[in-house]
Amino acid sequence: CKAMHVAQPAVVLASSRGIASFVCEYASPGKATEVRVTVLRQADSQVTEVCAATYMMGNELTFLDDSICTGTSSGNQVNLTIQGLRAMDTGLYICKVELMYPPPYYLGIGNGTQIYVIDPEPCPDSDF
């Protein structure tokens, strides 16, 4: 297992609709054809794999399970979007990148993006 640098923004504020997007960039030492990206959430004394995708370079990301994530790739960058977030989902979201094929296997883990989620205020009742 070889180490690899992964960069991601320090802070992102989710939209009022609970959508947060950030870029995860990795310094690929070679020409990987198969890449796995995992988003981990570290908060509330827990570590959670929020979503994971494996993709062939140049292809769409295919996320596993009932994923709340979507994403696209461009070169050594992955554009990640997490939806359906609520205030209690605020936390540190860490990008983990694995170069699966061809060998050797590389692993990189970012420092994390602190995502802040603010639940929208309910609209006041109106007489109109």
Epitope: R41, T48, L64, D65, G84, D89
Partner: nanobody, 125 residues
Amino acid sequence: EVQLVESGGGLVQAGDSLRLSCAASGRTFSSYVMGWFRQAPGKEREFVAAISSSGALTSYADSVYGRFTISRDNAKKMVYLQMSSLKPEDTDVYYCAAGRGPWSPRPSLLTYDYWGQGTQVTVSS
């Protein structure tokens, strides 16, 4: 409806390993998020680990991260908790639970509808 039966608990020494198993019945097992929780007498039930319906995604309490591994076999309707480097503070009754709903950034807060009867794990120093 899902019925859950845990097994594999026992008395071990600190530093040892143990594997808990949870056998499920019910046709819809593969659609549930499965979790392990633990509880000591007089204390609140505590989240240990959870695994998504396909088994692709997991979640762990910080206190067990790197020491415990949760896994599942949907064909056999089984969930496992591999516990290693056990500590005296891991002593508890361990419960298997099944939760409905999509995977989320905080699976510990999902609604777990079905629970097993628990299995005792005792770690002596």
